[in-house]
């Protein structure tokens, strides 16, 4: 996250870090206690996922292994729509007061809602320094409209813009597949943004997760 | 079709201010998502990034040259541009301008200008 | 600056042959790495992103494979316009460095 802040304790229960060996690979959102989401283009064979700390590489933070993922199957290594996927835990998550799900969407919130990002992705850019905390950002949401006059034809029909006008406030790599939270419920996954990260007025991406709500349910249910 | 095109001296003496600029047509240099770069080749050598502009005016340089490179952007006609101070024979060169996509999940150039030969001497 | 190195420097192959370059990363780029063909006197082509995506257009002879340090780039079977100037790129950090190419020959 560029520009923003650290997260308030445990106000981010349903976030989870998902690591390749002990490095941080993506972010992810708890959904079920199977079942975390996060953005397809982090993809890996296995997952070790960190759950209950907002400390990266945190000793006393469950650790659940997850070999199962199951990405859209309209997921374009091209243009990057649908960048969603499913992974299975292979054991269900012990949920606490540290560890909930979110909440899905029953609706897709308008232009100007008020949201937080949150992440432990670089910090900086184009020069890399990785937070051990996770770390926030406020943000609100843009209309299609006007993220397609700074993206054009970079932008899907499904995905979701966020930002703060002027300022340099963002997501960056190692937020991928993290949670946009508005009013409480999950609204967007972090998808991509400009590199070098945090260019005034080029907004984030994220997939919108509120057009999503049937997939995710569809495929939790198949692979119970 | 985005395409790029090189314009400037073809020869300048050492000491001299290399001075090239990009013309883009097919898209437009204020859009999102993309950067504007330079990049250089030596004759019969390989390819060298010399430093990139975004629609915002931001700008990176390889640091190997920063000191000596200055590159604009003029989105109303456009163009954008590359300056070299104080040349020598070391910087003869084919100089190409190029777009990348350049987003936090994937980066490449995926347009090139034809490139333009630009020799230093006296 | 992350060091790209590019082998072999040049190679000979006939028409038909299988031809393989490969691009090693001075440090794990991810699958940050773009490979590009350079015919005399033209611009660079890009024919493979994200170390294994064939760009659009590009015949399927072309491919790519590899992640952290170590890829691959094929041609399956080598065609006479394949003679070219082939090189790797590094997305992964600025300043992005190119290897030294491999020049194809036909023999």
């Known amino acids: 996250i560029i520009d923003g802040y650290k997260c308030k304790e445990g106000s981010h229960p349903w976030q989870v870090a998902l690591l390749k060996g002990n490095q941080l690979h993506c972010g992810g959102v708890l959904v079920d206690k199977y079942w975390v989401l996060t953005a397809a283009h982090c993809k890996m064979g296995q997952y070790q996922v960190q759950l209950g700390s907002d400390k990266i590489g945190d000793q006393s933070a469950q650790k659940i292994k997850a070999t199962k993922s199951f990405r859209h199957p309209g997921y374009s290594t091209k243009t990057h729509v649908n960048d969603i996927m499913l992974v299975r835990l292979d054991e269900p998550v012990k949920m606490s007061s540290k560890v909930e799900a979110v909440q899905l969407p029953e609706h897709c919130e308008p232009p100007g809602t008020s949201c937080t990002v949150s992440g432990w992705g670089t910090t900086t850019s184009p020069d890399v320094t990785f937070p051990s905390d996770l770390m926030c950002s406020d943000v609100k949401l843009i209309s299609s409209r006007e993220c397609k006059k700074v993206y054009k034809d970079l932008l899907g029909k499904t995905m979701l813009c966020a930002g703060i006008p002027d300022s340099k406030t963002n997501t960056c790599n190692g937020d991928s597949g993290g949670p946009l939270v508005c009013n409480d419920t999950l609204q967007g996954l972090v998808s991509w943004g400009t590199y070098p990260c945090g260019q005034p007025n080029d907004p984030g991406v994220y997939t919108q997760v509120c057009k999503y709500k049937r997939w995710v349910m569809e495929t939790m249910k198949t692979h119970r | 079709q985005v395409q790029l095109q090189e314009s400037g001296p073809g020869l300048v003496k050492p000491s001299q201010t290399l001075s090239l600029t990009c013309t883009v047509s097919g898209g437009s240099i204020s859009s999102g998502g993309y950067s504007w770069n330079w990049i250089r080749q030596h004759p019969g050598k390989g390819l060298e990034w010399i430093g990139s502009?975004?629609?915002?005016?931001?700008?990176y340089y390889n640091p190997s040259l920063k000191s000596r490179v200055t590159i604009s952007v003029d989105t109303s006609k456009n163009q954008f541009s590359l300056k070299l101070s104080s040349v020598t024979a070391a910087d003869t060169a084919v100089y190409y301008c190029?777009?990348?996509?350049?987003?936090?999940?994937?980066?490449?150039?995926?347009?090139w200008g034809q490139g333009t030969l630009v020799t230093v001497s006296s | 600056d992350i060091q790209m190195t590019q082998s072999p420097s040049s190679l000979s192959a006939s028409v038909g042959d299988r031809v393989t370059i490969t691009c090693q990363a001075s440090?794990?780029?991810?699958?940050?790495l773009n490979w590009y063909q350079q015919k005399p006197g033209k611009a660079p082509k890009l024919l493979i992103y994200?170390?294994?995506n064939l760009e659009t257009g590009v015949p399927s002879r072309f491919s790519g494979s590899g992640s952290g340090t170590d890829f691959t780039f094929t041609i399956s079977s080598l065609q006479p316009e394949d003679i070219a100037t082939y090189y790797c790129q590094q997305a992964s950090q600025l300043p992005f460095t190119f290897g030294g190419g491999t020049k194809v020959e036909i023999k």
């Open positions: 440090q794990d780029i991810a699958n940050y």
């Open positions: 502009i975004y629609r915002s005016g931001s700008t």
């Open positions: 994200d170390a294994s």
């Open positions: 190029a777009r990348a996509k350049q987003l936090t999940l994937t980066r490449y150039f995926d347009y």
